[in-house]
């Protein structure tokens, strides 16, 4: 806290400019009018204030706006945004995408800080849903943003927003998140033709059910092994050898290298060895010929 002292004669700041960089903290406190600062916030970002001086400027704004800053000030906070606490940000009402972009720009190149996470949360809640423009902006700054949301939060994403999602935005998503996103993607891309549809839906297939995988196997999609390895194990297990062969096309040869890893390993255990042999890949571990396979899960469901 800077001690309150009268501003020395001739040092009252008529505007926010470079002359202030050699003011002591107490002089900034005494000689800079908070309302002037608020209207000239955009100038602060061009001036090499020290971190201590920025603390004083923040303190002045806090005093002027104890209930939270107006958006006209927030949009021009620049580097001062890095001084804000999540508690400060929770008082804000940010509605403009331009304001959001301006503040994300300040934090560019850094990890998502608690301040940024709070800002995004306030912004999305204010909008009521994660619309396409917002998602576009957020994933541009933070490719992993989508995967940082809970399945519950993802449920508020409208299908139309899925068009903004790039494959790399889903890299860190877990199956629970893809379970929520996949049906939205399916809806969003439903009017596309086969090959185009597959290109768009491919990143989301970690949430696809068995019946959709079966349908894809009839469309000559040639799924690569990386995508196949990300499929839900429970969705892959019921697929027949013929369906997997059609699904993977020329990539089927890659199964051999993955035979010890899920979901390939578990899928092999469910197939007849005779059927696996038809692939000519030397896959081992299938059900020997003459054995009867009982689907106990189906039996339990019936009883």
């Amino acid at each position: 806290e800077v001690e309150k002292t009268a501003c020395p004669s001739g040092k009252k700041a008529p505007e926010i400019d470079e002359s202030l960089i050699f003011y002591k903290k107490w002089e900034l406190e005494a000689c800079v009018d908070a309302a002037l600062l608020a209207t000239q916030m955009d100038r602060v970002n061009a001036i090499p204030f020290t971190y201590e001086q920025l603390d004083v400027l923040k303190h002045k704004l806090d005093e002027l706006y104890p209930q939270g800053y107006p958006e006209s000030v927030i949009q021009h906070l620049g580097y001062l945004f890095l001084k804000m606490s999540p508690e400060d940000i929770r008082k804000w009402n940010v509605t403009s995408l331009e304001t959001l972009k301006a503040l994300l720009e300040v934090n560019k190149g850094h990890e998502m800080s608690p301040q940024v996470a709070t800002l995004i949360d306030r912004f999305v809640k204010g909008r009521g849903q994660l619309d396409k423009d917002t998602l576009d902006t957020l994933t541009a700054f933070y490719p992993g943003y989508l995967c940082s949301l809970s399945p519950e939060e993802l449920s508020s994403v409208p299908p139309s927003s899925i068009w903004a999602v790039r494959p790399q935005d889903l890299d860190t998503c877990d199956p629970r998140q893809l379970d929520v996103l996949y049906p939205k993607a399916r809806l969003a891309f439903q009017n596309m033709n086969g090959s185009e549809y597959f290109v768009k839906i491919q990143s989301f297939l970690g949430g696809a059910p068995t019946e959709d995988l079966k349908a894809l196997s009839q469309q000559n999609v040639s799924m690569d092994l990386a995508t196949f390895m990300k499929l839900r194990t429970d969705a892959v297990l019921p697929l027949t050898v013929a369906e997997v062969q059609k699904l993977l096309g020329p990539h089927v040869e890659g199964l051999k290298a993955e035979e010890r890893h899920r979901p390939v390993r578990d899928w092999i255990l469910r197939q007849r060895q005779d059927d696996l042999d038809t692939l000519g890949l030397g896959l081992q571990g299938g059900i020997p010929n003459g054995y009867l396979v009982l689907d106990l899960s189906m039996q339990e469901a019936l009883s």
Partner: antibody, heavy 119, light 106 residues
Framework: QVQLQQSGPELVKPGASVKISCKAS????????MNWVKQSNGKSLEWIGV????????SYNQKFKGKATITADTSSNTAYLQLSSLTSEDSAVYYC????????????WGQGTLVTVSA | DIVITQSPAIMSASPGEKVTMTCSAS?????MHWYQQKSGTSPKRWIY???KLASGVPARFSGSGSGTSYSLTISSMEAEDAATYYC?????????FGAGTKLEIK
């Protein structure tokens, strides 16, 4: 302990440019402003300008605008001073100097870099 | 720009003698800092915020002043004090220095 290690002496031709460096150690480079000061032939000191290394914001003495460019690289904790369109008037020792808490002057100085402009 | 006039330009003092040098600013400044420089070395912060002694500076040094008039005083001159002393105003952009007072030992 705080140290500011400057690059070695430079002999440059009139009209050319030179970029001298100041590597900081022993403190958090981004927490303090870095200043550059000129001293011509044992004469007095002239403040050239200052940079906030964290944000890259600068302020210059009007006299050196267009002549000097101050930059900083936070990954290597190094500040730079580039001087352009050199003349004999630019021959001098250039110092980097670390700003101190709440404007308490320049607590630490580099050893100086002698720039000689000669045909 | 604020012009700092330092006087005297050169002075000499005998060991044990009291020494005072002054800086006059063309307009009022909030703080004055003082630096000591010996031949062939970098300046060292000597007195800051008008009257505070930098780390390692002997207690025989003192600084005072306000407005446009500031001074540095050595209560009892010692041989190691022979150097050039520069004052610097810390109030207005751009920062400016005095031309220096060269203090010699008699």
């Amino acid at each position: 302990q705080v140290q500011l290690q400057q690059s070695g002496p430079e002999l440059v031709k009139p009209g050319a440019s030179v970029k001298i460096s100041c590597k900081a150690s022993g403190y958090s480079f981004t927490d303090y402003n870095m200043n550059w000061v000129k001293q011509s032939n044992g004469k007095s000191l002239e403040w050239i300008g200052v940079i906030n290394p964290n944000y890259g914001t600068t302020s210059y003495n009007q006299k050196f605008k267009g002549k000097a460019t101050i930059t900083a690289d936070t990954s290597s904790n190094t500040a730079y001073l580039q001087l352009s369109s050199l003349t004999s008037e630019d021959s001098a020792v250039y110092y980097c100097a670390k700003g101190d808490y709440d404007g308490a002057g320049f607590a630490y100085w580099g050893q100086g870099t002698l720039v000689t402009v000669s045909a | 720009d604020i012009v700092i006039t330092q006087s005297p330009a050169i002075m000499s003092a005998s060991p044990g003698e009291k020494v005072t040098m002054t800086c006059s600013a063309s307009s009022s400044v909030s703080y004055m800092h003082w630096y000591q420089q010996k031949s062939g070395t970098s300046p060292k912060r000597w007195i800051y915020d008008t009257s505070k002694l930098a780390s390692g500076v002997p207690a025989r040094f003192s600084g005072s002043g306000s407005g446009t008039s500031y001074s540095l005083t050595i209560s009892s001159m010692e041989a190691e004090d022979a150097a050039t002393y520069y004052c610097q105003q810390w109030s207005s952009n751009p920062l400016t220095f005095g031309a220096g007072t060269k203090l010699e030992i008699k």
